[in-house]
Interface confidence: low
């Protein structure tokens, strides 16, 4: 089913189709950054890969911004998302 992904799209319903996809990427980025799925970030060695954005394979940057309360709430929704 597409229910989980549709839920996330609905949360960003004020955006157009393209921006919804980018919005989802941002939310996934937040999940990755703040370990909301309960998994550790990839180790910070030279070969580590950390999907900060899906296509980004650089190490964790020192200037990561903290989430606002609203974003944290959205991330909580994302933690429930699983592949169909």
């Amino acid at each position: 089913s597409v229910s989980e992904i549709q839920l996330m799209h609905n949360l960003g319903k004020h955006l157009n189709s393209m921006e919804r996809v980018e919005w989802l990427r941002k939310k996934l980025q937040d999940v990755h950054n703040f370990v909301a799925l309960g998994a550790p970030l990839a180790p910070r060695d030279a070969g580590s890969q950390r999907p900060r954005k899906k296509e980004d394979n650089v190490l964790v940057e020192s200037h990561e911004k903290s989430l606002g309360e609203a974003d944290k709430a959205d991330v909580n929704v994302l933690t429930k998302a699983k592949s169909q």
Partner: antibody, heavy 117, light 112 residues
């Protein structure tokens, strides 16, 4: 509606240069991470490189065969992506596509680059 | 670099019947966060590629629900539950776990 329109392709001799452009509309270009993907005639898809949004550093990453020869840049005020190709080789002959987003959500129609003497 | 291998390279199909394409990666695309960094694209004859599936199993906007993606860390499958004539073209898988992003060699789907 998302629209990507590539231009600048053509015939160029080996060792020559060419600059491709990709005009974007229908989404917030300045927020988007953009990529170039190419396809040699009758062949499969090959990733060329990517540029991040300026807010994410604006940095670039390239495939090994083009690193040092190709440069990706962007002009957010013009909603345009560029691919500067120098020291072109015959094996660079391909249709070049610009794509949006983390998973290449949208593609342009492509522009053909032919490198031949 | 991560090598992506697709099979079969050619797939004759019958409209209304199911079809399946396999994609294998030389290393796991499953990150510790649970996401699989594998995408599927379709390039119809004479057209630009279009995104079908991203992150292993999520359908892109506007993609019919007859398309589905699944897989483990290294073995992935794109399934078409009931092939339609408009589904012909070349299907590509692509890994986006690490740069350089790499594509499979493509699977050409054609009507029998």
């Amino acid at each position: 509606e998302v629209q990507l329109v590539e231009s600048g392709g053509g015939l160029v001799k080996p060792g020559g240069s060419l600059r491709l452009s990709c005009a974007a509309s229908g989404f917030t270009f300045s927020n988007a991470w953009m990529s170039w993907v190419r396809q040699a005639p009758g062949k499969g898809l090959d990733w060329v490189g990517r540029i991040k949004s300026k807010t994410d550093g604006g940095t670039t990453d390239y495939a090994a065969p083009v690193k040092g020869r190709f440069t990706i840049s962007r002009d957010d005020s013009k909603n345009t992506l560029y691919l500067q190709m120098n020291s072109l080789k015959t094996e660079d002959t391909a249709v070049y596509y610009c794509t949006t987003g983390a998973t290449f959500d949208s593609w342009g129609q492509g522009t053909l680059v032919t490198v031949s003497s | 670099d991560i090598v992506m291998t697709q099979s079969p390279l050619s797939l004759p199909v019958t409209p209304g019947e199911p079809a399946s394409i396999s994609c294998r990666s030389s290393q796991s695309l499953l990150h510790s966060n649970g996401y699989k960094f594998l995408d599927w694209f379709l390039q119809k004859p004479g057209q630009s590629p279009q995104l079908l599936i991203y992150l292993g199993s999520y359908r892109a906007s506007g993609v019919p629900d007859r398309f589905s993606g699944r897989g483990s860390g290294t073995d992935f499958t794109l399934k078409i539950s009931r092939v339609e004539a408009e589904d012909v073209g070349v299907y590509y898988c692509m890994q986006a776990l690490q740069t350089p992003w790499t594509f499979g060699q493509g699977t050409k789907v054609e009507i029998k």
